[in-house]
Amino acid sequence: IPLSRTVRCTCISISNQPVNPRSLEKLEIIPPSQFCPHVEIIATMKKKGEKRCLNPESKAIKNLLKAVSKERSKRSP
């Protein structure tokens, strides 16, 4: 992981850009805490394992979250 930071927030910049759910390895949603006041959404991409910080307020990202949770609920028995 680049930039070992003392502050617990991870995201210095965020992206509104939509992410194709099929290109996602992992999606982490970190709720606000005493260490970081932001909701942080970190997408790990299949290609090269690159990570992106996503904007939780972006319409495209909200749609992505819906798609991912729908996919998860399909898979769970």
Partner: antibody, heavy 123, light 107 residues
């Protein structure tokens, strides 16, 4: 296209204060981490400070900690650097720079740079 | 802090030459390395990020390679507009640090 325009530099006496500004346009400023980088005359580049997209996180180089304050006003698309207790060694061109545009987690490389503003500390 | 050592500090070359600049980190930085070009009295310009990814709009004659501690910037065929100073920069950990620069001059 992305534009960063610094202002506020000038000749100041040691011990005085100065506030630099960086007006941003052509990208989503409120999503972008922003940095200040400086360059002393005839020398290399030195990173000074960073602020996250909404102004909550700030980091500073040890050489400026406690004297410099980075801040931003997302409603005005403007980045600031407040410099207190100026020293001769603070003489430099100060550049503002954006984080890499793709916003990969942990990015700390600089995509776009302003033209710089010269701060000269001299009695 | 991670120290970045660039070599050579200056070099003379002719138009059409292949030019190689190296950058060494004092500890491993994976691929978290960027290269910048700076012309006199101008702001630096981003050339390469993540060690080998070309910034949008940068000519393909520029390329970067390496990972860990040893990195290279190559200009395959030097053009008149490439005479400038080049800096490497690590962004594996704060503070981001730059190499001392390599000045590419006309032979």
């Amino acid at each position: 296209q992305v534009q960063l325009v610094e202002s506020g530099g000038g000749v100041v006496q040691p011990g005085r204060s100065l506030r630099l500004s960086c007006a941003a346009s052509g990208f989503t400023f409120s999503n972008s981490g922003m940095h200040w980088v400086r360059q002393a005359p005839g020398k290399g580049l030195e990173w000074v400070a960073v602020i996250d997209y909404d102004g909550i996180i700030q980091y500073y180089a040890d050489s400026v900690k406690g004297r410099f304050t980075i801040s931003r006003d997302n409603s005005k698309n403007t980045l600031y650097l407040q410099i207190n207790s100026l020293r001769a060694e603070d003489t430099a061109v100060y550049y503002c720079a954006t984080e890499r545009g793709t916003h990969y987690y942990g990015s700390g490389s600089f995509d776009y740079w302003g033209q710089g503003t010269l701060v000269t500390v001299s009695s | 802090d991670i120290q970045m050592t660039q070599s050579p500090s200056s070099l003379s070359a002719s138009v059409g030459d292949r030019v190689t600049i190296t950058c060494r980190a004092s500890q491993g930085i994976s691929s978290w390395l960027a290269w910048y070009q700076q012309k006199p009295e101008k702001a630096p310009k981003s050339l390469i990020y993540a060690a080998s990814s070309l910034q949008s709009g940068v000519p393909s004659r520029f390329s970067g390679s390496g990972s860990g501690t040893d990195f290279t910037l190559t200009i395959s065929s030097l053009q008149p507009e490439d005479f400038a100073t080049y800096y490497c920069q690590q962004y594996n950990s704060y503070p981001p640090t730059f190499g001392g620069g390599t000045k590419v001059e006309i032979k």
